[in-house]
């Protein structure tokens, strides 16, 4: 049960995280105009990865796409790439993890296959989360650098009467969405990797496997073949600990290749 819960929770957390990464990538507010020097501006600027927008006090909002590819800063292109790679890996990870979920049975899929798929999706989620966090962090670093550069420019050469206030940009909502979403995807991936360990059948062969059934005498059969209790075969020789204390996962019978759902 613990493994199923960990896997399911990992999937849900990753799903929320990837949805957040997609949302952050599409959002226009990656950087917003810093209002420290002019808190009552009638024109508010904000920028995203794909377009820049201006919201006027009149209520009119105008957005313009970055229709050039070569003219854009290399850092912006890198951030775009990181976010897209994060989304693609996350989407593939989600697809893989759906089939890897313990609660979903597809034909004759072995537990080892599910374990491998869980691990694969977990790694994909981790990389996806790291890509998102890296992308957002690179953009944030770019903002901080530009902010201090424009601040330096703002306070130099102001001997004249006319002030030309340079627009400075600060962190937008998308950055925080991206950081949180990347973190969630990363956590979801780690949970999937942890679940994979619980799913993977142990290779140690035991001479005997005990089956307990109420109202029947306990039958022992070496090799773990079908016993008189009527339980399904346990060809994987699942380790059953002595002492009788077991989790639900440890008691669960596993379907053979002849079982269909």
């Amino acid at each position: 049960m613990a493994v199923t819960a960990c896997q399911g929770l990992g999937f849900v957390v990753s799903l929320i995280g990837i949805a957040g990464i997609i949302a952050a990538t599409c959002m226009d507010q990656w950087s917003t105009q810093d209002l420290y020097n002019n808190p009552v501006t009638a024109v508010f600027n904000y920028q995203g990865l794909w377009r820049s927008c201006v919201r006027e006090s009149s209520g009119f909002t105008e957005c313009r796409g970055y229709f050039t590819l070569l003219g854009l800063p290399a850092m912006l292109q890198a951030v775009r790439a990181l976010m897209i790679v994060g989304i693609v890996l996350g989407a593939i990870g989600l697809l893989v993890s759906i089939f890897a979920l313990k609660c979903i049975r597809i034909g004759s899929m072995e537990d080892s296959a599910k374990a491998n798929m869980t691990l694969t999706s977990g790694i994909m989620f981790i990389v996806s989360g790291l890509c998102a966090i890296a992308g957002v962090s690179v953009f944030a670093n770019m903002l901080v650098t530009n902010f201090w550069m424009s601040t330096a420019n703002m306070y130099t050469g102001m001997g004249g009467m006319v002030q030309t206030v340079q627009t400075r940009y600060t962190f937008g909502a998308a950055l925080f969405v991206g950081w949180v979403a990347g973190g969630l995807t990363l956590i979801g991936g780690v949970m999937m990797c942890i679940a994979c360990r619980g799913l993977a059948p142990e290779e140690t062969n035991y001479k005997a496997v005990s089956y307990h059934a109420s109202g029947h005498s306990v039958a022992y059969k070496p090799g773990g073949f079908k016993a008189s209790t009527g339980f399904g075969s346990n060809t994987k020789n699942k380790k059953i600990y002595d002492g009788g204390a077991r989790t639900e996962d440890e008691v669960q019978s596993y379907p053979s290749k002849h079982d269909y759902v």
């Epitope: 009638a42 006090s57 009149s58 209520g59 009119f60 006319v162």
Partner: antibody, heavy 120, light 113 residues
Framework: EVMLVESGGDLVKPGGSLKLSCAAS????????MSWVRQTPEKRLEWVAT????????YYLDSVKGRFTISRDNAKNTLFLQMNSLRSEDTALYYC?????????????WGQGTSVTVSS | DIVMTQSPSFLSVSAGEKVTMSCKSS????????????LAWYQQKPGQPPKLLIY???TRDSGVPDRFTGSGSGTDFTLTISNVQAEDLAIYFC?????????FGAGTKLELK
């Protein structure tokens, strides 16, 4: 046709109060940012206050901050300006104005104005 | 606050002439986000409320004759009226539409010679 009709202007003593109203018609009132602009007897134009569309954010001229309150009733298509602690320098013709949606924050429509005189 | 300075205060012209008036702002009215200038020009005839002529420093409002031309960027702006007509005699105001308070210039009064 866009119409802005101001009312409520009067002769009032210093320290007194007055509430101006502006009845709007001919357009979807709730979709526009509205302002009050006054014109002094010397013909100088002075922006007084603005209430934004959507957010309902309000902005005021420093000299009227804390004394004047701009508000709107979208259901009744009406703009208000509550003026308290009136001073002689508030004497002016008060215009109800609409900021154009695509006019770069410029006022595209003005009312005919309502006169406020603050005198003892 | 952004201070708007208009010059000259008075302009005497004859019908058919070309006239130019200036408006200077204490801060730039140019917005880098959309590469636009936030300055408007209004015309006020006696006994009437002001009427929008130009917005965005150079865009004529609908119904405004093409003899009215707005130009300039940043802090220096100009309104030009080519072939002045008798109906153009009025006071012309410029306005900062970039930052609150949305300040106006003192106006330029156009008179007949």
């Amino acid at each position: 046709e866009v119409m802005l009709v101001e009312s409520g202007g009067d002769l009032v003593k210093p320290g007194g109060s007055l509430k101006l109203s502006c009845a709007a018609s001919g357009f979807t009132f709730s979709r526009y940012t509205m302002s009050w602009v006054r014109q002094t007897p010397e013909k100088r134009l002075e922006w007084v206050a603005t209430v934004s569309v959507g957010s309902g954010n309000t902005y005021y001229l420093d000299s009227v901050k804390g004394r004047f309150t701009i508000s709107r009733d979208n259901a009744k298509n009406t703009l208000f300006l509550q003026m308290n602690s009136l001073r002689s320098e508030d004497t002016a013709l008060y215009y109800c104005t609409r900021l154009g949606q695509t006019q770069r924050n410029a006022v595209d429509y003005w009312g005919q104005g309502t006169s406020v005189t603050v005198s003892s | 606050d952004i201070v708007m300075t208009q010059s000259p205060s008075f302009l005497s012209v004859s019908a058919g002439e070309k006239v130019t008036m200036s408006c200077k702002s204490s801060q730039s009215l140019f917005n880098g986000g959309n590469q636009k200038n936030y300055l408007a020009w209004y015309q006020q005839k006696p006994g009437q409320p002001p009427k929008l002529l130009i917005y965005g420093a150079s865009t004529r409002d609908s119904g405004v004759p093409d003899r009215f031309t707005g130009s300039g960027s940043g802090t220096d702006f100009t309104l030009t009226i080519s072939n002045v007509q008798a109906e153009d005699l009025a006071i012309y105001f410029c306005q900062n539409d970039h930052s609150f308070p949305l300040t106006f210039g003192a106006g330029t009064k156009l008179e007949l010679k």
